[in-house]
């Protein structure tokens, strides 16, 4: 009874299509698969950024797989062939591992890369990224931003840079069609007459960096002798009401400060008849139903009521 063996996949490689971190892992079937003609071969692929403690593992019947990586670091991957018992008429068989690595040869020292990269997707409409030049770089250094997300044929360069002292320090992006809920890849590289500049790679999802506009149309309505309803409206723009959380700050007679977080565009406040002045402001943020993270908006304009009977009047600002 000879032990059944299977070879690892051939020509295992990591291919960079120029998508700034979205890479292809591909391979060919193992040699001598003729013995297993009636058999569906599967492959177990493990991969990670170098330095990561955990491997990502997938099993596939394909000869390729795609995923996103951090190109600031190297990538390592390994793959082997799997045969379920039906292929061997006995027990499961797995091959030895085929291994490969990939990294972009870094140019320049780490200090030359951009510092404090910050990207904000304003009102889920306008993406703006800004950065500071690398430490100790000369004024002749210029940085260029490239971006890609699934749906674009190739990486695009920023066409509307924000400049300071002749240097690019930010990018205003054009309208980004169908770009949320998927990885958005950015590379900022640079050039200088003087010395090589290190590239930087960033990946995020746009819905997680949204900064909405503040709420508008703040109003008061007297509900009863001891209750006042505060109301506001969602800001203009593409973000639906179901995606907002709100934070309210209420000041009563310049002393009591109430803060509350709510999911709707109303808040009912208990008051006393002695209340002479009531002011509140609201800000908004995209909630957990629509994103994993977000940025609070600026506070709305302040809305105040002073000394008037709220049953007679609803204040609008």
């Amino acid at each position: 009874d000879t032990e059944i063996k299977v070879n690892p996949p051939q020509d295992f490689e990591i291919v960079d299509p120029g998508y700034l971190g979205y890479l292809y892992l591909q391979w060919q079937p193992p040699l001598s698969l003729d013995h297993f003609k009636e058999c569906t071969v599967e492959y177990e692929l493990k991969y990670r950024n170098i330095g990561s403690e955990t491997w990502k593992t997938i099993i596939t019947k394909n000869l390729h797989y795609k995923d996103g990586f951090d190109l600031n670091k190297g990538i390592e991957a390994k793959i082997h062939t799997l045969l379920p018992w039906q292929c061997t008429n006995g027990s499961e068989v797995q091959s030895s591992w085929a291994e490969t690595t990939y990294w972009i040869s870094p140019q320049g020292i780490p200090e030359t890369k951009v510092q404090d990269m910050d990207c904000v997707y304003y009102n889920w409409q306008y993406l703006l990224c800004s950065w500071k030049p690398g430490i100790g770089v000369l004024l002749d250094t210029n940085y260029n931003l490239f971006y890609w997300y699934e749906g674009l044929d190739h990486a695009l360069q920023c066409v509307d840079y924000i400049k300071a002292d002749g240097q690019n320090i930010g990018c205003r992006f054009p309208y980004l069609e169908a770009s949320d809920y998927k990885d958005f890849y950015i590379c900022v590289n640079g050039s200088s007459e003087n010395k090589p500049i290190r590239s930087s790679y960033f990946t995020f999802q746009l819905q997680n960096i949204v900064k909405p506009l503040p709420p508008v149309y703040l109003t008061f309505t007297r509900e009863s002798s001891c209750e006042i309803k505060l109301k506001w409206s969602i800001p203009l723009g593409p973000i639906p009401a179901r995606c907002f959380d709100y934070e309210i700050e209420i000041r009563e007679d310049d002393t009591t400060l109430v803060t509350a977080t709510v999911e709707n565009e109303t808040y009912t406040l208990k008051t006393t008849n002695e209340t002479r002045q009531l002011c509140f402001v609201v800000r908004s943020k995209v909630n957990i139903y629509c994103s994993d993270d977000g940025i609070w908006s600026e506070w709305s304009d302040k809305q105040c009521w002073e000394g008037e009977d709220l049953s007679k009047k609803t204040l609008l600002r």
């Epitope: 569906t40 599967e42 177990e44 593992t57 997938i58 099993i59 596939t60 019947k61 394909n62 797989y65 379920p84 018992w85 039906q86 027990s91 499961e92």
Partner: antibody, heavy 121, light 108 residues
């Protein structure tokens, strides 16, 4: 006749633990990959975990990774799911399922009757 | 992850009707697709595997077709026993194994 019989479900508080078992009969258990699939009340099917025939390879959905552990005892023809740090969203009927063909997962040709896990305080 | 999208979510039909349910994968899954039938309070039952192979014991009025990203389950002449919820499932690449959200076939 192939049979899969789950047990071990019940009511547990958030943060608690449960161990589900699936007793298999009617086929050569040690030759087949096995899986757990769950279904929250009124919802669709959600794959939870897979284990290959020998038990040497295990796979998990992101929603349970680090909290659930799948294992098997081929001498007892039994599949297990150890569930720790349970959350309200883990409330579901849990099914064990036999893989028709494949290393870890595939088409599931036999399913157990399911065991209900309720996570509530 | 590979997303599976079924349509319609609900389908009203009469006994004897020809019924078609569609399943779309977010990327090519070759023919690695299964269809299941589930009745309330019961476990799912395998109908079709490898996109078009009929599971043993399943009536021949059930058939599956498609490859790549577009798949269909067809019931040639709907019977009273066929009113149930149907799920598609991909097993091309995992984890995770993914299911469609289900299609409920109800009496018109």
């Amino acid at each position: 006749e192939v049979q899969l019989l789950e047990s071990g479900g019940g009511l547990v508080q958030p943060g608690g633990s449960l161990r589900l078992s699936c007793a298999a009969s009617g086929f050569t258990f040690s030759r087949y990959a096995m899986n757990w699939v769950r279904q929250a009340p009124g919802k669709g099917l959600e794959w939870v975990s897979a284990i290959n025939a020998s038990g040497g390879s295990t796979y998990y959905a992101d929603s349970v990774k680090g909290r659930f552990t799948i294992s098997r005892d081929n001498s007892k023809n039994t599949l297990y799911l150890q569930m720790n740090s349970l959350r309200a969203e883990d409330t579901a009927v849990y099914y064990c399922a036999k893989v028709r063909y494949g290393w870890g997962a595939g088409a599931f040709d036999y399913w157990g009757q399911g065991t209900l896990v309720t996570v509530s305080s | 992850d590979i997303q599976m999208t079924q349509s319609p979510s609900t389908l009203s039909a009469s006994v004897g009707d020809r019924v078609t349910i569609t399943c779309r994968a977010s990327q090519s899954i070759s023919s690695w697709l299964a269809w299941y039938q589930q009745k309330p309070g019961k476990a799912p039952k395998l109908l079709i595997y490898d996109a078009s192979s009929l599971e043993s014991g399943v009536p021949s009025r059930f058939s599956g077709s498609g490859s790549g990203t577009e798949f269909t389950l067809t019931i040639s002449s709907l019977q009273p026993d066929d009113f149930a919820t149907y799920y598609c499932q991909q097993y091309d690449t995992y984890p995770p194994i993914t299911f469609g959200q289900g299609t409920k076939v109800e009496i018109k």
